[in-house]
Amino acid sequence: QTSVSPSKVILPRGGSVLVTCSTSCDQPKLLGIETPLPKKELLLPGNNRKVYELSNVQEDSQPMCYSNCPDGQSTAKTFLTVYWTPERVELAPLPSWQPVGKNLTLRCQVEGGAPRANLTVVLLRGEKELKREPAVGEPAEVTTTVLVRRDHHGANFSCRTELDLRPQGLELFENTSAPYQLQTFVLPATPPQLVSPRVLEVDTQGTVVCSLDGLFPVSEAQVHLALGDQRLNPTVTYGNDSFSAKASVSVTAEDEGTQRLTCAVILGNQSQETLQTVTIYSFPAPNVILTKPEVSEGTEVTVKCEAHPRAKVTLNGVPAQPLGPRAQLLLKATPEDNGRSFSCSATLEVAGQLIHKNQTRELRVLYGPRLDERDCPGNWTWPENSQQTPMCQAWGNPLPELKCLKDGTFPLPIGESVTVTRDLEGTYLCRARSTQGEVTRKVTVNVLSPRYE
């Protein structure tokens, strides 16, 4: 009778084991072990027992002891069970961002590991077990579906293998995959709201505001604002679940025309975009041209108004005839025209909006000097000793210099309050002088003496 010890062994992969083959007869013709494993026979006294060191055991194996005794041949098997933890425990790659409300399939793959009967695969969220299944197949695959919730944000999912050899007197061997950190997000189906000027003038600045509500986590949202190829640099203000991105946009003549203004919000692996067109236009103020800004009375003056080729102008409220970018008027300069404003108003239609620009020029008319009865009376009669203010206003542009002298030397104090005396009486020659010429006028002052009864 052949016997083997131990009859069952559990050993780590690549390990060694001592196996003893024994026979019940004293002088066996043959005693050995049948195995393809590398073996080393340990020398022992006696013929009925042999000890072998079997090494580099990579797989389960069943070495067989055999002996040949006078009463016949017999065999006995030992069962070697190899254990080893999996070589690979891996969660199938997933996008780190997952939209709330989506079903997320977690797939764990396990390569290797033995004995499979003692190997379990566990899917976890943090420390909470989601699924536990025996490892079946090569690679073993365990899947579970998770409905993504907002509170899963930042949660770590992992896969763990448990090789439980405690029933065999060994320990529980655990292997854990690299964790998968879930980033959950909510990006509403509504596009962002974009507030901006529909038209923008060259060499000016406009303000663009892009906003969106109902985002989670709002701090992770990326906002891209651009006008054509020009990336804008917004200042972003965050609310609980909203943001507002404000940016200044400057445009130059190169940008003229219709440009696309885009606001894109990127969150997770999704994006929402709003497009708007902005018309960049160039519209200089109209030009008011006077033949000469300063003319002498009676001169013919041409006033021209010129604006953008597509504009329509009115000059002093009178539309151009025909309606267009140019208008003009002719006038003979009179003193009343001095300081007269000529206003040109130009209107340009840009993307359905009417843009208005104005320009005003003032005409200076040189005239005079003038001394007339109304403003410089030729005769004053004042009671003696009364308080009077002699008035004489000379008109003209430029304003004339006025002097009133009696006998070429005695001045009449124009515009000053004086006490009337006999000395004031007489005829004065008032002379108004400017670059335009000179005029004179006689002014007589009569003094009434009081009657003494």
Partner: antibody
């Protein structure tokens, strides 16, 4: 009677594959370790692979990673899948039963020629 | 790997002669030594296993001896059907290795 009958040899190009079969009869196939041995023309015998009763497999360095030994106890059959074949794999291949640590029963042999 | 060295590689003998073939292992293999006979175009045939045990059906003129590293196959009286090539093989360790063979030819 106890015998091993082989099939599956032939001519194959370098880099090609071939599968040899060995059908056992007359004994309890599942109770024995099985081996493949080859012999190049005019040369000696060379051990190629072994499979234990538990399905454990063994190979020399010259064929490891290219050859795969397997057994189907239900069909009393032994197989040798040979991939990435080289000219130096040209030989007569024998399957053999191992009993009492010796190859006591041999198949008739099958010729494998690797040549372009 | 255990290297098996057989001597001689060939020998010419006559029917009835005693033939001795030796086999040396590069390390101790206890009694895990087998002898095979192969005729041209045929599969090898097991003659002796465990260094000295005669395989069932093999004539008693064949015998084996030795243990450890040195082993001998003896054919006490060569018969015409014994002209063949003889191989020793160790089954102590994997890979299983064979001697290079000894060709026994008719003188």
């Amino acid at each position: 009677q106890v015998q091993l009958v082989q099939s599956g040899g032939g001519l194959v190009q370098p880099g090609g594959s071939l599968r040899l079969s060995c059908a056992a009869s007359g004994f309890t196939f599942s109770s024995y370790d099985m081996h493949w041995v080859r012999q190049a023309t005019g040369k000696g015998l060379e051990w190629v692979s072994a499979i234990g009763t538990a399905g454990d497999t063994y190979y020399p360095g010259s064929v490891k990673g290219r050859f795969t030994i397997s057994r189907d106890n239900a069909k009393n059959s032994l197989y040798l899948q040979m991939n990435s074949l080289r000219a130096e794999d040209t030989a007569v291949y024998y399957c053999a039963r191992s009993a009492l640590s010796a190859f006591d029963i041999w198949g008739q042999g099958t010729m494998v020629t690797v040549s372009s | 790997d255990i290297v098996m060295t057989q001597t001689p590689s060939s020998l010419s003998v006559s029917v009835g002669d005693r033939v001795t073939i030796t086999c040396r292992a590069s390390q101790s293999i206890s009694s895990y030594l087998n002898w095979y006979q192969q005729k041209p175009g045929k599969a090898p045939k097991l003659l002796i296993y465990a260094a000295s045990t005669l395989q069932s059906g093999v004539p008693s003129r064949f015998s084996g001896s030795g243990s450890g590293t040195d082993f001998t196959l003896t054919i006490s009286s060569l018969q015409p059907e014994d002209f063949a090539t003889y191989y020793c093989q160790q089954s102590y360790s994997t890979p299983r290795t064979f001697g290079q063979g000894t060709k026994v030819e008719i003188k």
